[in-house]
């Protein structure tokens, strides 16, 4: 019989206190006087003194109002002792359950919630979730069960109910069509949380819904027609800046313009880029324009965005009429580099060629000519006709001025425009070889022994070109053939000089005549040092001294 059922006590009781809750009773009180006491948190340990017991009657007392949100359940022990203090019962467990009262309002976890949703989404799309808490009990009562609702929406555009909220979870969703960032970029919702599952206390907060940009607006040219003037031949010249307006979010891919020349640029003369700040289309020349060929270009430019359109949108097109302005253009030699074959050594005053320039301009301008660079000073140019004549001896073999048979001259043409312009041309004279050089032996000094002499092989060179070179022929003159012999080898490009009679040690002149395939003859004196020696020698030995 020493038991007590769990005791339920409502929180926030108004008393009067102490308030009798239940009576502890031991059936041992028939035999002896019993004294009752309680222990545990809420009695003799913190929070002390909430509960007490009438020592002699066993009445369990509540001394003050309870707060379920602070302590929802107390676990105490009841004790029964006799007059002499001896325990007459085992300690008894006393459970006191604090029952809830709806004494707390819901509280939103934030004063302002922020969420976002893309403009133009389907109704039903989830936006964000809001949360409110309520300290009251939501398990055994509805005191802490929160129901969410939207109290108001600002602006009320295009409908006053663009959003809905899940009454239990606080999830906000789009409910209506017509979210348009360009009209309403942000909605402010006043949201409510009401306890008792919607029938109790209410609290409010704000949910701000940002409408995110979708590329649902096409960029539009403003104006759509342009006229521009560009000097001919200018490359990289800014022709025109094209302006567009786009209702989408500035500096976003849905706003940034992409330009495309759709037509009118057959020669690929123009290019268009987007200015990173202004979003304007900058039309420039990729190649020089030619006034004489075409003095007006009509371009058609289309504009889209970096981001694709989210729906089918009509694209805007601009028309740009580009007027090409005439400029005084430099005369152009035709061809820019002229190759002319001319025989070397032609007489002074002999014509070489006529080299003229054409003026791209339509007016009949007068062109005058002059030589700009003539390293050897061999040529003259008529200022009116462009006739080039020889004033010096053109020498193909002149290694200082001629490279690979070519003599390079730069000429200049000047028009009589205001201001005058000049153009240059290159004249490449390919000098045709003439047999104007005889063969020459190398070396022209030899050293030879007067006893058992070694044959001296001399290389034959000729500055001219074939066929004015080998095979060569050799002949000794001026009695040189008394002591020497000269024979050309089989290939005809070397001469072998041999001493055929004894000569005493000394230096001698050997007169050697060489002729080329075109019979051009060249006499060369070979200095021959004869030494007193046998066979091969490079320098004469000094006089022998005995010891």
């Amino acid at each position: 019989d020493w038991v007590v059922a769990p005791i339920s006590v409502p929180e926030n009781g108004k008393g009067p206190f102490p308030q009798r809750l239940n009576q502890l009773k031991s059936n041992k009180d028939r035999d002896t006087k019993i004294f009752y006491s309680i222990t545990g948190p809420g009695a003799d340990s913190p929070p002390e003194g909430v509960f007490a017991v009438e020592k002699e009657t066993g009445w369990l007392l509540l001394n003050k109002p309870l707060d379920r949100e602070e302590i929802a359940k107390y676990e105490l022990f009841g004790h029964a002792v006799s007059e002499n203090g001896a325990s007459v019962e085992d300690p008894m467990n006393i459970s006191i359950i604090v029952t809830d009262q709806n004494d707390h309002k819901p509280k939103f976890t934030q004063d302002t919630f922020r969420g976002s949703v893309l403009e133009g989404v389907l109704p039903g799309t989830s936006v964000m979730q809001v949360t409110a808490t309520d300290e009251d009990d939501a398990i055994y009562t509805y005191n802490g069960v929160v129901a969410y609702s939207i109290h108001s929406q600002e602006p009320k555009d295009p409908h006053d109910l663009m959003f809905t909220i899940h009454r239990s979870t606080g999830t906000i969703s789009v409910i209506s069509s017509g979210l348009d960032r360009e009209k309403v970029p942000e909605y402010t919702l006043t949201i409510q949380a009401t306890d008792m599952d919607g029938d109790g206390s209410t609290t409010t907060a704000v949910a701000v819904v940002e409408i995110l940009d979708a590329n649902d607006n096409a960029p539009m040219f403003d104006p759509q027609k342009y006229e521009a003037h560009v000097p001919e031949n200018a490359v990289g010249h800014e022709v025109q800046r094209l302006t567009v307006t786009d209702l989408d979010a500035p500096n976003s891919p849905a706003w940034r313009a992409t330009y495309l020349i759709m037509g009118g640029d057959d020669g690929d003369h123009f290019t268009i880029t987007t200015h990173p700040e202004s979003n304007q289309g900058i039309l420039t020349t990729r190649k020089g324009l030619d006034f004489e060929a075409k003095n007006q270009h009509t371009l058609y430019v289309e504009v889209t965005n970096e981001a694709p359109f989210v729906l089918k949108l009509p694209t805007s097109t601009a028309t740009i009429v580009v007027h090409v302005e005439d400029v005084n253009e430099a005369p152009v030699f035709v061809p820019p580099s002229k190759v002319v074959e001319v025989q070397e050594g032609i007489p002074t005053g002999e014509p070489v060629c006529v080299y003229t320039a054409e003026d791209p301009d339509k007016e009949n301008q007068k062109i005058s000519y002059r030589i700009l660079r003539d390293p050897a000073g061999w040529l003259a140019m008529d200022p009116d006709s462009g006739q080039v004549t020889a004033v010096g001896t053109l020498d193909r073999e002149d290694e200082q001025f001629v490279r690979n048979n070519i003599y390079e001259v730069m000429v200049l043409a000047m028009d009589n425009g205001s201001p005058p312009t000049t153009g240059t041309g290159t004249l490449l004279l390919t000098l045709i070889d003439v047999n104007d050089h005889g063969p020459v032996p190398e070396p022209r000094q030899i050293t030879i022994c007067n006893q058992s002499p070694v044959r001296q092989v001399l290389n034959i060179t000729d500055k001219d070109l074939s066929p004015h070179t080998s095979p060569f022929q050799a002949q000794l003159t001026d009695d040189s053939d008394i002591y020497w012999t000269a024979e050309v080898n089989e290939e005809g490009d070397t001469v072998v000089l041999s001493l055929k009679k004894f000569l005493k040690q000394d230096t001698y002149d050997v007169h050697l005549s060489l002729s080329d395939h075109g019979n051009k003859e060249q006499l060369t004196v070979i200095r021959a040092t004869v030494c007193d020696c046998h066979g091969h020698v490079e320098t004469c030995p000094g006089p022998w001294k005995g010891g």
Epitope: L122, P123, T125, T164, H166, S173, L311, K312
Partner: antibody, heavy 117, light 111 residues
Framework: EVQLLESGGGLVQPGGSLRLSCAAS????????MSWVRQAPGKGLEWVSA????????YYADSVKGRFTISRDNSKNTLYLQMNSLRAEDTAVYYC??????????WGQGKMVTVSS | QSALTQPASVSGSPGQSITISCTGT?????????VSWYQQHPGKAPKLILS???KRPSGVSNRFSGSKSGNTASLSISGLQAEDEADYYC???????????FGGGTKLTVL
């Protein structure tokens, strides 16, 4: 008067394709999300697909995902449903309807699509 | 199996009143006040008769009314008339796809 008028239904073999159109009049078509709902013979209503007013956002029921494509041309005030790889279970009356404010209204008169060999 | 539960059929005599129930869950009917009712005559398209639980579109008779309690919505028709004989479908907005759930439909017979 607000009106939706479907066209393009008919008989098609399994695996075949069909395109339904829905011409809208009497309201600002581009301002409203649109949907397709179907009803198999003797059965209830099934939401098939939806598209936002701009056409930038779409939804498909699992049963048709990957086979059906919803689109719209706001310049022509017309909604489309391209149906590919059709199956016998796609046989139904197909309705177009405006979708918003948690409801479907108005509805077109419906077009019968029969998938049979 | 439909997401929302409706009785397969109800009947009533002319002049009587009937009620059709539509039971969902706390994520659809219970969560939002976006329950709609549609009337469908044989061979015709569905026609909206109630939206947002109890709002009648213009042109719909005031004999049709709606209510909601917890996870169950109801359609009431008073003063039954022969032309009320039709199939009635409820629908509810729901959190998450597919956003619209339909009931299986209720056949109303006017005796």
């Amino acid at each position: 008067e607000v009106q939706l008028l479907e066209s393009g239904g008919g008989l098609v073999q399994p695996g075949g394709s069909l395109r339904l159109s829905c011409a809208a009049s009497g309201f600002t078509f581009s301002s409203y999300a649109m949907s397709w709902v179907r009803q198999a013979p003797g059965k209830g209503l099934e939401w098939v697909s939806a598209i936002s007013g701009s056409g930038g956002s779409t939804y498909y029921a699992d049963s048709v995902k990957g086979r059906f494509t919803i689109s719209r041309d706001n310049s022509k005030n017309t909604l489309y449903l391209q149906m590919n790889s059709l199956r016998a279970e796609d046989t139904a009356v197909y309705y177009c309807a405006s979708w918003g404010d948690g409801t479907l209204n108005p509805w077109g008169q419906g077009k019968m699509v029969t998938v049979s060999s | 199996q439909s997401a929302l539960t409706q009785p397969a059929s109800v009947s009533g005599s002319p002049g009587q009143s009937i009620t059709i129930s539509c039971t969902g869950t706390s994520n659809d009917v219970g969560a939002y006040n976006y329950v709609s009712w549609y009337q469908q005559h044989p061979g015709k398209a569905p026609k909206l008769i109630l939206s947002e639980v109890n709002k009648r579109p213009s042109g719909v008779s005031n004999r049709f009314s709606g209510s909601k309690s917890g996870n169950t919505a109801s359609l009431s028709i008073s003063g039954l008339q022969a032309e009320d004989e039709a199939d009635y479908y409820c629908s509810s907005f729901t959190s998450g796809l597919p956003w619209v759930l339909f009931g299986g439909g209720t056949k109303l017979t006017v005796l």
